[in-house]
């Protein structure tokens, strides 16, 4: 079974090692989730041809997946630590409903999908501790999330495969941008 960072023996401080700093812990969590996404993408690509589809074709979807934009302050030009941190947390909170959708979408990687979801929750908690400007963080409405989840689950098989692929690709891109931005702080 996949082990969350913080649960493995390497994270328990050995006699001569130092415990992880807050930045190291966050970095490790993001990398752990990205490794998980990589495994899930492998299963998705093996069972459908979505991975070969062009980006343009896949862009023609009505999913409102979180995405980094210049105004979010997470890129080199216009980098702003506080704005960026708020964007990362808000984005992760918005991804949670999509991660819930992924839970029954995998056969051989079911535990991996659960681990990605749980680790994202823990990552949000770590980042919320780091963020000073918590007022600006908006949490998605539970009722909105519930109806979105129902709508996604009602799609036909092809659309569900497409949705799964898009969620994983977008989440990977969002996390990689987050990782780079957090390392700059």
């Amino acid at each position: 079974a996949p082990v969350l960072p913080g649960e493995d023996s390497k994270d328990v401080a050995a006699p001569h090692s130092q415990p992880l700093t807050s930045s190291e812990r966050i970095d490790k969590h993001i990398r752990y989730i990205l490794d998980g996404i990589s495994a899930l993408r492998k299963e998705t690509c093996n069972r459908s041809n979505m991975c070969e589809s062009s980006k343009e074709a896949l862009a023609e979807n009505n999913l409102n997946l979180p995405k980094m934009a210049e105004k979010d302050g997470c890129f080199q030009s216009g980098f702003n630590e506080d704005t960026c941190l708020v964007k990362i947390i808000t984005g992760l909170l918005e991804f949670e409903v999509y991660l819930e959708y992924l839970q029954n979408r995998f056969e051989s990687s079911e535990e991996q999908a659960r681990a990605v979801q749980m680790s994202t929750k823990v990552l949000i908690q770590f980042l919320q501790k780091k963020a000073k400007n918590l007022d600006a963080i908006t949490t998605p409405e539970p009722t909105t999330n519930a109806s979105l989840l129902t709508k996604l689950q009602a799609q036909n098989q092809w659309l569900q495969d497409m949705t799964t692929h898009l969620i994983l690709r977008s989440f990977k891109e969002f996390l990689q941008s987050s990782l780079r931005a957090l390392r700059q702080m």
């Epitope: 970095d27 490794d35 890129f75 390392r183």
Partner: antibody
């Protein structure tokens, strides 16, 4: 872009040394910075990294607890405080600027540190 | 820790030849990889980052590729100024280690 290291020299085992890196030609406070070293006739070894605001700091296991990376943004200077020095710390020490992806896009000329009695 | 294994350790080639240097990671480093060139007695210079993005001012005869754990640097039509040592480095998990290096010598 110019990076100029200083502070190297001969140090006794167990001793301390503080290296500096003066940056010019770019907005220093907008970039993460690295220290890298190279022992004589050996390969490159990453030593430490510091983010632009100093809240992200990483060290190589070989120097953790002995070396401290820091920066003074108003003075455009990067530092490496080295303590409990060992003979295996003998190397050319380079400071390097980090690009957005972590890679080192500009390097200084290096300052040589020799740990010997 | 992620280990990077570079091969070959040394290589002799002639001007005009094409050479490929490989870098194998002990785990998936998700393209968080850079390549550097270092000439004798000089500081290293960035060639490629993100596994395949050419750094500013680097000639187009250099190209990086790869994914997961396998990466390579290709130099087309070697020029006299290309001889020296080449290093890969990852930025996935700390420590951000370098490969052992590849010494490219003139034949």
């Amino acid at each position: 872009v110019k990076l100029q290291e200083s502070g190297g020299g001969l140090v006794q085992p167990g001793g301390s040394r503080k290296l500096s890196c003066a940056a010019s030609g770019f907005t220093f406070s907008r970039f993460g910075m690295h220290w890298v070293r190279q022992a004589p006739e050996k390969g490159l070894e990453w030593v430490a990294y510091i983010g632009r605001g100093s809240s992200t700091i990483y060290y190589a296991d070989t120097v953790k607890g002995r070396f401290t990376i820091s920066r003074d943004n108003p003075k455009n200077t990067l530092f490496l405080q080295m303590t409990s020095l060992r003979s295996e710390d003998t190397a050319m020490y380079y400071c390097a600027r980090s690009n957005w992806d972590g890679a080192m896009d500009y390097w200084g000329q290096g300052t040589s540190v020799t740990v010997s009695s | 820790d992620i280990q990077l294994t570079q091969s070959p350790a040394s290589l002799s080639a002639s001007v005009g030849e094409t050479v490929t240097i490989t870098c194998r990671a002990s785990g998936n480093i998700h393209n968080f990889l850079a390549w550097y060139q270092q000439k004798q007695g000089k500081s290293p210079q960035l060639l490629v980052y993100n596994a395949e993005t050419l750094a500013d001012g680097v000639p187009s005869r250099f190209s990086g590729s790869g994914s997961g754990t396998q990466y390579s640097l290709k130099i087309n039509s070697l020029q006299p100024e290309d001889f020296g040592s080449y290093y890969c480095q990852h930025f996935w998990s700390t420590p951000w280690t370098f490969g052992g290096g590849t010494k490219l010598e003139i034949k």
